[in-house]
């Protein structure tokens, strides 16, 4: 999906009002310095591509993020404020089998959510030069 035509300000508002708090809740008890940010993004569409990938694509050691509250809110934000996004998701669903994954918070998941926090912060500051 090409995130170029999303309403970035509306997505930013959703992040600031609620998604950010859910990410903090998920990370509660973890030191902010515990993980190094290794994933970056260069502009808002790129950031949303990376955010979608880290949030919804299962990775080795962390397969359970999609059912977390911040993930649900991210998905709904993309569906409402990115034209055609929900249609791509609906179509993709037809080929998927139902997978009911238990929510398990592993260290790998905490690291992944830490990366997500960094991507969201970058998304909110699009004019900053890439380090």
């Amino acid at each position: 999906y090409d995130f170029t035509n999303c309403d970035f300000e509306k997505i930013k508002a959703a992040y600031l009002s609620t998604i950010s708090k859910d990410l903090i809740t998920y990370m509660s008890g973890t030191k902010s310095t515990e993980f190094n940010n290794t994933v970056s993004c260069s502009n808002r569409p790129h950031c949303l591509t990376e955010i979608q990938s880290l949030t919804f694509n299962p990775t080795a050691g962390c397969a359970s993020l999609a059912k977390e509250m911040f993930a649900m809110k991210t998905k709904a934000a993309l569906a409402i404020w990115c034209p055609g996004y929900s249609e791509t998701q609906i179509n993709a669903t037809q080929a998927m089998k139902k997978r009911r994954k238990r929510k398990v918070t592993t260290n790998k998941c905490l690291e992944q959510v830490s990366q997500l926090q960094g991507l969201w912060r970058r998304f909110n500051r699009p004019l900053l030069k890439q380090q």
Partner: nanobody
């Protein structure tokens, strides 16, 4: 398998109000999110509003300030209160529960009541 049954569609005049209901055969928030989509003739299906188990809500710009989404956990029912209706709100409305990893599941959609705004 979750069943969703929508009701409340019909013909309404511009400026009028209507409330859609979506009854689920199980915990409405079993997977944290309920949404109302709509599809106007010849257009893509769009998500107009979503509500989460923590009570927070999202609205599309086109309906913000006119539509209100809510849920009654004790009745396993979600609602969409639609006020100040416009002809461009004419569409088939679907409620959907997110019941699959990473995508909206068509398996959990009801038939969708048609709501027509016309004088």
């Amino acid at each position: 398998e979750v069943q969703l049954v929508e009701s409340g569609g019909g013909l309404v005049q511009p400026g009028g109000s209507l409330r859609l209901s979506c009854a689920a055969s199980g915990n409405i928030f079993a997977n944290n999110i309920m949404g109302w989509f709509r599809q106007a003739p010849g257009k893509e299906r769009e998500l107009v509003s979503a509500i989460f188990s923590d009570g927070s809500t999202y609205y599309a710009d086109s309906v913000k300030g006119r539509f209100t989404i809510s849920a009654d956990n004790s009745k396993n029912t979600a609602y969409l209160q639609m006020n100040s209706l416009k002809p461009e709100d004419t569409a088939v409305y679907y409620c959907a529960r997110d019941d699959i990893v990473g995508a909206w599941s068509l398996d959990c959609w009801g038939q969708g009541p048609l709501m027509t705004v016309s004088s």
